[in-house]
Interface confidence: low
């Protein structure tokens, strides 16, 4: 039964749940359909179109699918809390036919001292308290149960874990007389997993821990711990994987150095250094052992923690990430960009690309943006002709045992997708940029000129005349 895996269901009961092992991977795209992939390898697009059409025609049959909402469940263990002591929780939409579980960690920066946490509590209370959380949330992007919006995992059990610990999902300290705030991000994840085991997660085949921004970094910090937790609880059958979106930051030199005054201007290394102490932050054990005491902040940076991780992780990162630029004190205000800044931005893209060199599963478009996976149009961006849902599908397949020990990429199914063009929005599928003052959409050529990129400079490395390049960019090619 090794070589060819079909999706035949045997016996009457829903097939396998956990037994005792965590292996990288058996991701068949739509696990409920009796389909055999082997005959369609050559024409995947047509095949996926058929699956989509079949899914859409079956869609009305499933009453549970008609309600798109994820429902709020506050943790039963109320000692695991948000910053202000209110119970943490999660939003869940079950998909009873599926043994895939997607747990999404929300993002939203962080605070690292009493002063900026107080300020955050005043202005962004939802990120520090569950008191005003809505009863339901709509799943979008990778959390959508609509096959057309989420061709990757529409049929999965969807879990959205709101970020209310302000600690990049790393904290392990409770509120006390001494501590005005609780920072329990790492504990919240563990408790959500524990509670979900009683809601069907115990029967999972794959748990994908995903997250965006601070949630993406949270994935890198927690994915191995979740795998270990499940093994210890007797569910090593569940394959734990990570999907880190826009959480792969660089501890690079800021464009302009500023003192560590607030969350946004403080250099990330200093913010995290202070944060870890304030949050009683925990990092993956194998990474921690690589650094001296007091140097655990290193493990918040993707390129340092990734090589120590055991679970498979797919990294999604814009080469010109807006949060990265913000902490580097680059603020693109619409004024023409000076050459020094242009070179800084281009170098950032180059450095980021370099850190992804040895990350086999990665998707890094050369765009100026932030976060992607829970955007409704997350399917639109392509790198080298491959969309992100498609790349994730290929990742699932590459992890699946049917490809035996072969480490060579699957033909026509790439998982390492990093743009090589050197400036923001040189990829024509990048999300549309808007002028932040007028709100007007800009095409790539307008955007680059708006940013002060000299068309001659941009065109030359491509072996093009500026006029040719402008024509190409204006046509979106």
């Amino acid at each position: 039964s090794e070589g060819r895996k079909t999706w035949r269901r045997r016996g009457q009961q829903p097939p396998p749940p956990p037994r005792t092992e965590a292996a990288p991977a058996a991701g068949q795209p739509v696990e409920s359909f009796p389909l055999d992939f082997t005959a369609v390898e050559g024409n995947m697009d047509s095949f996926m179109a058929q699956v989509k059409s079949l899914a859409q025609s079956l869609y009305p049959c499933s009453a549970q699918q008609l309600n798109e909402d994820l429902r709020l469940h506050l943790l039963l263990n109320t000692s695991v809390t948000c910053n202000d002591g209110s119970p943490a929780g999660y939003y869940l939409k079950e998909s009873r036919g599926s043994r895939r579980w997607l747990l999404f960690l929300e993002g939203g920066w962080y605070c690292f001292n009493r002063e900026n946490c107080d300020s955050r509590y005043d202005t962004m209370r939802r990120l520090m308290s569950s008191r005003d959380w809505p009863r339901t949330r709509t799943g979008t992007g990778i959390l959508s149960s609509q096959p057309e919006e989420n061709p990757y995992w529409w049929n999965a059990n969807m879990v959205f874990i709101p970020y209310c610990s302000s600690d990049v999902w790393s904290g392990a300290s409770s509120k006390s007389e001494k501590n005005e705030y609780a920072f329990m991000g790492a504990l919240i994840i563990q408790e959500v997993v524990r509670e979900l085991l009683g809601r069907g997660l115990s029967g999972a085949k794959v748990l994908l821990l995903a997250g965006s921004s601070a949630g993406g970094t949270g994935v890198l910090l927690n994915v191995d711990r979740v795998a270990e937790q499940l093994e210890k609880l007797g569910y090593p059958a569940i394959q734990v994987r990570g999907l880190a979106d826009s959480g792969w930051f660089l501890d690079n030199k800021q464009y302009r150095h500023t003192d560590c005054v607030d969350t946004i201007t403080c250099a990330p290394t200093e913010a995290i250094r202070r944060g870890i102490r304030y949050w009683n932050g925990v990092v993956p054990e194998r990474c921690r052992r690589q650094f001296q005491e007091g140097e655990e902040w290193n493990c918040f940076f993707g390129y340092k923690v990734y090589p120590t991780l055991r679970c498979p992780v797919f990294v999604v990162q814009w080469l010109f990430d807006e949060a990265q630029l913000t902490v580097d004190n680059v603020h693109l205000t619409g004024q023409p960009v000076q050459e020094g800044l242009r070179l800084y931005i281009q170098n950032l893209g180059r450095e980021l690309r370099h850190t992804l060199k040895d990350v086999p599963a990665s998707f890094a478009p050369a765009c100026l943006s932030h976060e992607i996976i829970i955007r409704s149009h997350w399917t639109d961006v392509q790198v080298k002709g491959t969309s992100l849902p498609r790349a994730l599908h290929c990742w699932d397949r590459s992890l699946h045992d049917s490809h035996k020990a072969s480490k060579t990429p699957l033909k026509g199914c790439p998982v390492h997708l990093v743009d090589s063009c050197p400036w923001p929005h040189c990829n024509p599928s990048c999300p549309t940029v808007r002028d932040q003052f007028t709100g007007q959409e800009m095409n790539v050529a307008q955007f680059l000129m708006h940013m002060g990129f000299d068309m001659q400079t941009v065109a030359q490395p491509q072996g093009l005349e500026p006029s040719e390049l402008l024509g190409m960019l204006s046509n979106g090619s």
């Epitope: 749940p17 037994r19 965590a22 085949k205 795998a227 045992d401």
Partner: antibody, heavy 119, light 111 residues
Framework: EVQLVESGGGLVQPGGSLRLSCAAS????????MNWVRQAPGKGLEWVSY????????YYADSVKGRFTISRDNAKNSLYLQMNSLRDEDTAVYYC????????????WGAGTTVTVSS | DIVMTQSPLSLPVTPGEPASISCRAS??????????MHWYLQKPGQSPQLLIY???NLESGVPDRFSGSGSGTDFTLKISRVEAEDVGVYYC?????????FGAGTKLELK
């Protein structure tokens, strides 16, 4: 063809040590949890030990805890069982088995290697 | 530990006739809609082979005269028509918790 081949069994005195090996082929060894299961002469099957695919987790039956150590080398597609302080009651055929992703059952078994503990 | 009790311990059957083996767990081995009970056959002089996993799922390559049923603590393996090649010892095994344990075995022989 998916195959597990055990080796390293033999006659050993009580208190002695032995190291069993299991060579895997025909599947992605590094993706599966592996187990040792034994069968004493004329008796039933007894689960001995488990190791996860990544080696993060190991489990042992109470009867061997502290004496046996399971390990694996994914680069060599090999599973091992180091048996120390052997006792008469450890005499058995030792099977290496692959644990399926889906539910804690053993879907591939080796032919077994015989360990005899006797003075 | 979860104790698995199999019955009968010996089962003489006429070829072509049905056979049924029972396995009882000392506590429930079912959870979240799944039953962590599996069945193996060990033919004379061979290593065990998987027949049924998760109570009712037929392993690839196993003849469909074999079937499994049950949930909670009581499980049954049925052979609709016994053939000569079915001779051997049948074991049930649970994977609900550690340690994983097997039943004592049921020896199926031909009359």
């Amino acid at each position: 063809e998916v195959q597990l081949v055990e080796s390293g069994g033999g006659l050993v005195q009580p208190g002695g040590s032995l190291r069993l090996s299991c060579a895997a082929s025909g599947f992605t060894f590094s993706s599966y949890g592996m187990n040792w299961v034994r069968q004493a002469p004329g008796k039933g099957l007894e689960w001995v030990s488990y190791i996860s695919s990544s080696t993060v987790t190991t489990y042992y039956a109470d009867s061997v805890k502290g004496r046996f150590t399971i390990s694996r080398d994914n680069a060599k597609n090999s599973l091992y069982l180091q048996m120390n302080s052997l006792r008469d009651e450890d005499t058995a055929v030792y099977y290496c088995s692959r644990q399926n992703w889906d539910g804690g059952y053993f879907d591939v078994w080796g032919a077994g290697t015989t360990v005899t503990v006797s003075s | 530990d979860i104790v698995m009790t199999q019955s009968p311990l010996s089962l003489p059957v006429t070829p072509g006739e049905p056979a049924s083996i029972s396995c009882r767990a000392s506590k429930s081995v079912s959870s979240s809609g799944y039953s962590y009970m599996h069945w193996y056959l060990q033919k004379p002089g061979q290593s065990p082979q998987l027949l049924i996993y998760l109570a009712s799922n037929l392993e690839s390559g196993v003849p469909d005269r074999f079937s499994g049923s049950g949930s909670g603590t009581d499980f049954t393996l049925k052979i609709s028509r016994v053939e000569a090649e079915d001779v051997g010892v049948y074991y049930c095994q649970h994977s609900r918790a550690l340690p994983l344990t097997f039943g004592a075995g049921t020896k199926l022989e031909l009359k």
